[in-house]
């Protein structure tokens, strides 16, 4: 296993619709053809997997049908979008990149993007 640098923004504020997008960029030392990207969430010292996708270079990222993540790739950049976020989902989202094929296997883990989610204010009751 060889180490690889992964860069991601330090902080992002999700949209009022609970959508957060950020780029995860990795310094590929070679010509990988198969890449696996995993998004981890760290909160209260607990780390959980949010979503993961394996893709062939030049192809779209394919997450599971029920995943809250979507993404696109371009060169050594992966543009990740996480949707359906609520205030309780605020936390540190870490991008993990693995170059699966061809060997050697490379692993890179970013410092994390602190995503803040603000629940929209409830609309005031209106009399008709």
């Amino acid at each position: 296993c060889k180490a690889m640098h992964v860069a991601q923004p330090a902080v992002v504020l999700a949209s009022s619709r609970g959508i957060a997008s950020f780029v995860c960029e990795y310094a590929s030392p070679g010509k990988a053809t198969e890449v696996r990207v995993t998004v981890l969430r760290q909160a209260d010292s607990q780390v959980t997997e949010v979503c993961a996708a394996t893709y062939m270079m030049g192809n779209e990222l394919t997450f599971l049908d029920d995943s809250i993540c979507t993404g696109t790739s371009s060169g050594n950049q992966v543009n990740l979008t996480i949707q359906g976020l609520r205030a309780m989902d605020t936390g540190l989202y870490i991008c993990k990149v693995e170059l699966m094929y061809p060997p050697p296997y490379y692993l890179g883990i970013g410092n994390g993007t602190q995503i803040y989610v603000i629940d929209p204010e409830p609309c005031p009751d209106s009399d008709f």
């Epitope: 330090a10 902080v11 504020l13 950020f22 205030a87 605020t90 602190q114 803040y116 603000i118």
Partner: antibody, heavy 116, light 106 residues
């Protein structure tokens, strides 16, 4: 090294607007947020809101909603805070700061005086 | 909005003594920071995430607590530690500050 340099002191009349700038250097501007905090003379700190320089999304204090606008110019690594319909109780030192989980780097502060 | 109440309002201590500052929230808080401010200066971040020390902060400063009760402890007061200390919650919008605790020389 990380630096945040704010625009100079302003004197405004009630009802006017003020726009304070905050020029960042020494780091990747779009990777961080910019938070705005003010402090009235002899008083404590008041959070005004923040902007994600990465995507331009904003989160404002409820009491200032409708009067405040925070923006960024990523080409010059500068953040702006505009406050409209100024009142005498808006007289304060206005600080910008680099935000992630708390403000680790601060501007020097901009004194805004609202007086007729 | 979450109201943060700091106590005591003023703490009179001598250099070398231990300082314990309290910050109580009106409802549960998930993220809390502590700042130090000296007259005529911008605040300085000491602690984020309730217990993580910011870069360059001496280890005599420590933060603890969760939920609604948080504490900033200065194990041995140095002359430069006499200042006003603020807590800030940033887990629930609007983010809010406490009213501050002044640590003065006895």
């Amino acid at each position: 090294q990380v630096q945040l340099v704010q625009s100079g002191a302003e004197v405004k009349k009630p009802g006017a607007s003020v726009k304070v700038s905050c020029k960042a250097s020494g780091y990747t501007f779009t990777s961080y947020g910019i938070s705005w905090v003010r402090q009235a003379p002899g008083q404590g700190l008041e959070w005004m809101g923040w902007i994600s320089a990465y995507n331009g999304n904003t989160n404002y204090a409820q009491k200032l909603q409708g009067r405040v606008t925070m923006t960024t110019d990523t080409s010059t690594s500068t953040a702006y805070m505009e406050l409209r319909s100024l009142r005498s109780d808006d007289t304060a030192v206005y600080y910008c700061g680099r935000w992630v989980r708390g403000v680790e780097y601060w501007g020097q502060g901009t004194l805004v005086t609202v007086s007729s | 909005e979450i109201v943060l109440t700091q106590s005591p309002g003023t703490l009179s201590l001598s250099p070398g003594e231990r300082a314990t500052l309290s910050c109580r929230a009106s409802q549960s808080v998930s993220y809390l920071a502590w700042y130090q401010q000296k007259p005529g200066q911008a605040p300085r971040l000491l602690i984020y995430g309730a217990s993580s020390r910011a870069t360059g902060i001496p280890d005599r400063f420590s933060g603890s607590g969760s939920g609604t009760d948080f504490t900033l402890t200065i194990s041995r007061l140095e002359p430069e530690d006499f200042a006003v200390y603020y807590c800030q919650q940033y887990g629930s919008s609007p983010w809010t500050f406490g009213q501050g605790t002044k640590v003065e020389i006895k």
